[in-house]
Interface confidence: medium
Amino acid sequence: KSPVFGPQEVSSVEGNSVSIKCYYPPTSVNRHTRKYWCRKGASGRCITLVSSEGYVSSNYAGRANLTNFPENGTFVVNIAQLSRDDSGHYKCGLGINSRGLSFDVSLEVSQGPELPNGTEVYTVDVGRTVTIKCPFKTENAPKTKALYKKIGQTSVLVIDSRNYVNPNYKDRIRLRIPGTGQLIFTVVIDRLRLSDHGLYLCQAGDGSNRDEKNADLQVLEPEPELVYEDLRGSVTFHCALGLEVANVAKFLCRVNSRETCDVVINTLGKRDSAFEGRILLNPQDKDGSFSVVITGLRKEDEGRYLCGAHSDGQLQEGWPIQAWQLFVNEESTIPRSPTVVKGVAGGSVAVLCPYNPKESQSLKYWCLWEGAQNGRCPLLVESQGLVQEQYEGRLSLLQEPGNGTFTVILNQLTTQDAGFYWCLTNGDTRWRTTVEIKIIEGEPNLKVPGNVTAVLGETLNIPCHFPCKFSSYEKYWCKWSNTGCQTLPSQDEGPSEAFVNCDENSRLVSLTLNPVTRADEGWYWCGVKQGHFYGETAAVYVAVEEKKVAGSRYVSPAKADAAPDEKVLDSGVREIENKAIQDPRLFAEEKVVADTGDQAGGSRASVDSSSSEEQGGSSK
């Protein structure tokens, strides 16, 4: 399908002008290539009428132009002095007329209505309000005032000053007679319907001295605003319906093939399941306006959307609406990234979030979508650090790999972490994306001990077991803080051939803290990565206590994945208090995690990746 998009139907009246906007993907080639507006003939050929290279056909001379806006990816065709002969089928496009990078536009030019002299024309959108002004002479001031609608040759009474109201206008029309001295009465019609369209007659008095004034009421369906967004990106519909419906339920619906409108979301709590996890209805402003954000755009999201207000939270005739025609461009600048990421209970996920690469300095955010109250998204982490304290020790936002992608790592997964998450920046809002985290059956690949208690001044060694499939990955340990995870200096990782065979004894990367200080207390992550792309992580909490007994603190590699309550005893190894059954966050709370800067020099904290034989003793 062509990525060029414009209005499908354009209608106007003889003598008027039209402005037709066409959208295209703003690639470098597209921005500079020829733009054209051509008319389709009976033969199927499309004859150029105006182009961006300065060509204007004789038929359009002096009344048409084409302007390209390369920075927006749009071009506009303006045509003035329209005649009935301009009605027909056209194309706006890029490159060569026959190439297919185009969009079909139907233009209909109709004859203006024949109106009696002195007729006042009122042009109002459906659902809105019109005020018809009716002047009269002094002698008719005390006489009956009335408004009629002309239907064919007859006039039907709509309202008069003797309290008559036509049933078709019940509860939405009023006649106002001003105080003395003002020789004008007004008729106000609310919630206009398409059927209200037509010629009206104001009348004051009767007989030959009566005052009459013709009013032509044109009730229009709102012209849909064209919205051109990228696949996988985000769209925001801003809906301003006016103060008169500020306290009425609001909705966004999508027009279906039967020309009815299916509710996408409304303020009464209804939401289309197709938009689960990727829609928010923002609260309304004091002027009654509101907005709806949809992320993770799909091709099937294309179509005509209406927003409106009605107590039922759905489309009803005669209530104000706003319209959009959404086109989803498949030639997207937003890179593909997984929309579903799977993790196992106790394991981790690393989510890649795209952002506009031109905005590398923008703040990055990650939030958890909640379906309650028309959708909302509490921020969990931002590029400046953790936002929600309950994620302490298990969530981090990394700027890597950079150049249009950042990474969010969440570990210690539970079934409660399943759900939809949004990647956001404070820059280009079209780059908001959604990812769903699913928790599946399985075991974490990386195995670390539960919580470890280290003794001040002694040596602590923490093992991290990994499976053979990670043998080619880079392994690392880092110390978590609420502003990131500081990688700990790595010692020689041992002979590379240790990983080639990937035997039972070589799948280990160890962290050594020597000597243990108070600042070492906190969360540590063991992880694997390939270049700037992060894989799995496992977290362990290290508590630091005063020295009680002499001897070094050592976690047996062979028993690193011991059951939570298991007491690990080994030759020369002290008892490990494995507190994994407790929620480590309970005793991690309110604790200030010290900066790890002092670990950069020397080999106080070191990472060793080698076989367990080289660790000094086996528990086998």
């Epitope: 923002n282 609260p283 309304q284 703040l363 955010y365 400046q384 936002v387 404070n426």
Partner: nanobody, 124 residues
Framework: QVQLVESGGGLVQAGGSLRLSCAAS????????MGWFRQAPGKEREFVAR????????DYADSVKGRFTISRDNAKTTVYLQTNSLKPEDTAVYYC?????????????????WGQGTQVTVSS
């Protein structure tokens, strides 16, 4: 957490105006929904106004609609409440609050960061 400090309160005559400011420190408030609440003597704390992170969406209590305006300056990490046509019943301690919510409906419970408050007294 974000630290919030309110200023701009004072004594003013009915019909007068005050501009309350709320300065954030500790971290940016760029991603936060910000709100103003007030508490009159012997009454519960009540919602006054809120603004989303971009400043494009605002919401007001019925009692202040048309008189108060909330705005924000993310570069200065500051939120403002312009109070016009003040009435004696507006007398209260005004609190600034922050909520780590990216748009959507935010209830008063969701505001996790609070300032110490600034006193506004409107005399008749």
């Amino acid at each position: 957490q974000v630290q919030l400090v309110e200023s701009g309160g004072g004594l003013v005559q009915a019909g007068g105006s005050l501009r309350l400011s709320c300065a954030a420190s500790g971290r940016t408030i760029n991603g936060y929904v910000m709100g103003w609440f007030r508490q009159a003597p012997g009454k519960e704390r009540e919602f006054v106004a809120r603004i989303d992170w971009s400043g494009s969406s605002t919401d007001y209590a019925d009692s202040v609609k048309g008189r108060f305006t909330i705005s924000r300056d993310n570069a200065k990490t500051t939120v403002y409440l312009q109070t016009n046509s003040l009435k004696p019943e507006d007398t209260a301690v005004y609190y600034c609050a922050g909520s780590a919510y990216y748009s959507g409906y935010v209830t008063h419970r969701d505001f996790g960061s609070w300032g110490q408050g600034t006193q506004v007294t409107v005399s008749s």
